[in-house]
């Protein structure tokens, strides 16, 4: 029975050429976390590896950053950019607990943060 | 060959205080949850602390008899886990046991073979 | 705190019997975080059983573990010379961990 819960940072907008933090959170369970993915709909973006540390994928590498934390920095964006984010939590011995967040990259000035919400 | 070596164990006074130290060899440490945990003589084990990966923050959890009072504490570098033991008791009297647990792909669980902390006057 | 009642707190078989040992939780444990130890005098405890049925490494297959929610069982088919020792069930489903008090398998 798998009892955590992924919190996000949800819903986020973020003008062209900005950075943005990907934030996740996994709560409510004792399982230990082995590795966290980042993926970009069905590219892997990036991993935080319990034995193994960071890596970036290599067509990444120029606009990624690792962190803060198991989080992901995502730099110099472009409209692109918009789109599903999920943070993959692999975890012993629950499995994996997935968030998901959606990220708007806007040509105007005007970007407001979206509420954090929960994805049990 | 997988090893844990605990020490730091021995005789003190109660209220004073002690280090644990437990070295690990043959696996890999870094990926590795540590605890310790303890048996008083004649008596069955005890949880007394883990401290988690650097994935998992490092977090740090403590059973309820020496919390505020044991801290655990980990050098990834040194492929060692530490336990501080202040403000020891009498009723700390035990053998305590470094754990090691690791999943990758398998599950393994470690344990070293134990250091004696004695608190006595 | 989840409290773990082991039953029988000793057990006085012969070898070639069957053995039954019991652990009881006050609240539900998740079966991933249930762990079983044999413990020999003298020495520390060694994994046994993980995530209430899987055997760890080494273990004969005349050990097995079964249970769900707060009852959960280790089982020996028939047992031998080297199995008598002290077992001990663990969760760590919730903080803080626990273990039950154990229950002595001896040779009758």
């Known amino acids: 029975m798998m009892t955590g819960t992924i919190e996000t940072t949800g819903n986020i907008s973020a003008e062209k050429g900005g950075s943005i933090i990907l934030q996740c959170h996994l709560s409510s369970t004792t399982a230990q976390v082995t590795q966290v993915n980042w993926e970009q709909q069905d590219q892997l973006l990036a991993i935080c590896n319990a034995d193994l540390g960071w890596h970036i994928s290599p067509s990444f590498k120029d606009r990624v950053a690792p962190g803060p934390g198991l989080g992901l920095t995502l730099q110099s964006l472009t409209v692109n950019d918009t789109g599903e984010y999920f943070c993959i939590y692999h975890t012993y011995p629950d499995g994996t607990y997935t968030g998901r967040i959606f990220l708007e990259v806007l040509e105007s000035s005007v970007a407001e943060h979206g509420a954090r919400f929960q994805i049990p | 060959e997988v090893q844990l070596v605990e020490s730091g164990g021995g005789l003190v006074q109660p209220g004073g205080s002690l280090k644990l130290s437990c070295a690990a060899s043959?696996?890999?440490?870094?990926?590795?949850?540590m605890d310790w945990v303890r048996q008083a003589p004649g008596k069955g084990l005890e949880w007394v602390a883990e401290?988690?990966?650097?994935?998992?923050?490092?977090?740090?959890n403590y059973g309820e008899s020496v919390k505020g009072r044991f801290t655990i504490s980990r050098d990834d570098s040194k492929n060692t886990v530490y336990l501080q033991m202040n403000s020891l008791r009498a009723e700390d009297t035990a053998v305590y046991y470094c754990?090691?647990?690791?999943?990758?792909?398998?599950?393994?669980?470690?344990w070293g073979q134990g250091t004696l902390v004695t608190v006595s006057s | 705190e989840i409290v773990l009642t082991q039953s029988p707190a000793t057990l006085s078989l012969s070898p070639g019997e069957r053995a039954t040992l019991s652990c009881s939780a006050s609240?539900?444990?998740?079966?991933?975080?249930l762990y079983w130890y044999q413990q020999k005098p003298g020495q520390a405890p060694k994994l046994w059983i993980y995530?209430?049925?899987t055997l760890a490494s080494g273990v004969p297959a005349r050990f097995s573990g079964s249970g769900s929610g707060t009852d959960y069982t280790l089982t020996i088919s028939s047992l031998e010379p080297e199995d008598f020792a002290v077992y001990y069930c663990?969760?760590?489903?919730?903080?803080?961990?626990?273990f039950g008090q154990g229950t002595k398998l001896e040779i009758k």
């Open positions: 609240s539900s444990v998740s079966s991933g975080y």
């Open positions: 663990h969760q760590w489903s919730s903080f803080p961990y626990t």
């Open positions: 043959g696996f890999t440490f870094s990926g590795a949850w």
């Open positions: 995530g209430t049925s």
């Open positions: 754990r090691g647990a690791l999943y990758d792909g398998f599950y393994f669980d470690y």
């Open positions: 401290i988690r990966t650097k994935v998992n923050n490092h977090a740090t």
